[in-house]
Amino acid sequence: CSCAPTHPQTAFCNSDLVIRAKFMGSPEIIETTLYQRYEIKMTKMLKGFDAVGNATGFRFAYTPAMESLCGYVHKSQNRSEEFLIAGRLRNGNLHITACSFLVPWHNLSPAQQKAFVKTYSAGCGVCTVFPCSAIPCKLESDSHCLWTDQILMGSEKGYQSDHFACLPRNPDLCTWQYLGVSMTRSLPLAKAEA
């Protein structure tokens, strides 16, 4: 299995469903398929109201049964721990993989929690987080924000991932904006080439 590095905003925007949920136990293999499913208890839906229609909640999260097929393995035994799950919808079912953005809710900073609840959605369909994985890299559009965490931090979990969102500054321009108390502060030199 391999996964492309993903900024949390990209994970939010590319997912059909973003929910908060608790895992209720061990996975159950679904016979005659390559999938297994985890029973979950959804506590809040953050994205996907349109996609799910009348569905009141999701009881299961489906994932490939093998790690080589990017199956997700849930390691926590704590059934009261709440997780942020960003997944895909297929045939009315929530699907997740080892590549999904799936983290304990309490591991997110208050600013990140607010971003998943409210802020990231403002950038979906308008702005694009553009990964810079090797120098030189340049922006292909004014609607792109250059994501340099992999180069500067050596990891996809860096300053931009933790503290910034790529949001419209005006109809034709997107810039990195700080996820702190004020959402009006922009990251200096955000449009410069790396």
């Epitope: 299995c1 391999s2 996964c3 492309a4 059909d16 005659t32 398929t33 390559l34 999938y35 490939p64 093998m66 790690e67 080589s68 097929l69 990017c70 199956g71 895909r88 919808l89 297929r90 045939n91 699907h95 993989t97 080892a98 590549c99």
Partner: antibody, heavy 121, light 111 residues
């Protein structure tokens, strides 16, 4: 690098049995599904079945269930496709390939060179 | 069950761009399902060209690109070259996770 090397071409008569092989190297053979794909002369690709060599869990396409047997010997990193009684319609090129996951995608990322099976009286 | 439909043949002249379509249904390709594309030269094994929508394995030319709109995935080859003449197959997977191939498209490079 990942390599799948298949056994050589075979010429058989109807009713005979046959077992062809696919040897993997350059990766953890027991951790990935191996699929078998048929291509009849001048036709397209058809998935026959897959096997997980780690525990020999095997799944067949409904079209091939009962027609062939897929097996593996993890000690020598080899997967097999076998027939107990060949028919003329089994004449085809057979490929093995590694079934792989990338994010939400499932695909065949590496292929063997193919084994041509000819069944003729 | 999932079925993928491709045109039997397409053709183009060197330097041109061509597009090969792969059509499914709203329950498979209309969902999140990505499509992979394989190239097969006569007498050779298939080779992965595009995966997860528009990712290329190392060594595959950036003249090859993939896209998806609704129930149809597409493979576009720009700056067509003689060596691009081959059969092309799309592949997705069904709701059980098992692979499904399109019927294949024969690409002819004219002239």
């Amino acid at each position: 690098q990942v390599q799948l090397v298949q056994s050589g071409a075979e010429v058989k008569k109807p009713g005979e049995s046959l077992k062809i092989s696919c040897k993997g190297s350059g990766y953890s053979f027991t951790s990935y599904w191996i699929g078998w794909v048929r291509q009849m002369p001048g036709k397209g690709l058809e998935w026959m079945g897959i096997i997980y060599p780690g525990d020999s869990d095997t799944r067949y396409s409904p079209s091939f269930q009962g027609q062939v047997t897929i097996s593996a010997d993890k000690s020598i990193s080899t997967a097999y496709l076998q027939w107990s009684s060949l028919k003329a319609s089994d004449t085809a090129m057979y490929y093995c390939a590694r079934y792989y996951g990338f994010e939400y995608d499932l695909l065949f990322d590496n292929w063997g060179q193919g084994t041509l099976v000819t069944v003729s009286s | 069950d999932i079925a993928l439909t491709q045109p039997a043949s397409v053709s183009g002249s060197p330097g041109q761009s061509i597009t090969i379509s792969c059509t499914g249904t709203s329950s498979d390709l209309g969902g999140y399902n990505y499509v992979s594309w394989y190239q097969q030269h006569p007498g050779k094994a298939p080779k992965l060209m595009i995966y997860a929508g528009n990712n290329r394995p190392s060594g595959v030319s950036n003249r090859f690109s993939g896209s998806k709109s609704g129930n149809t995935a597409s493979l576009t080859i720009s700056g067509l070259q003689a060596e691009d003449e081959a059969d092309y197959y799309c592949q997705a997977y069904d709701s059980s996770g098992y692979p499904v191939f399109g019927g294949g498209t024969k690409l002819t490079v004219l002239g």
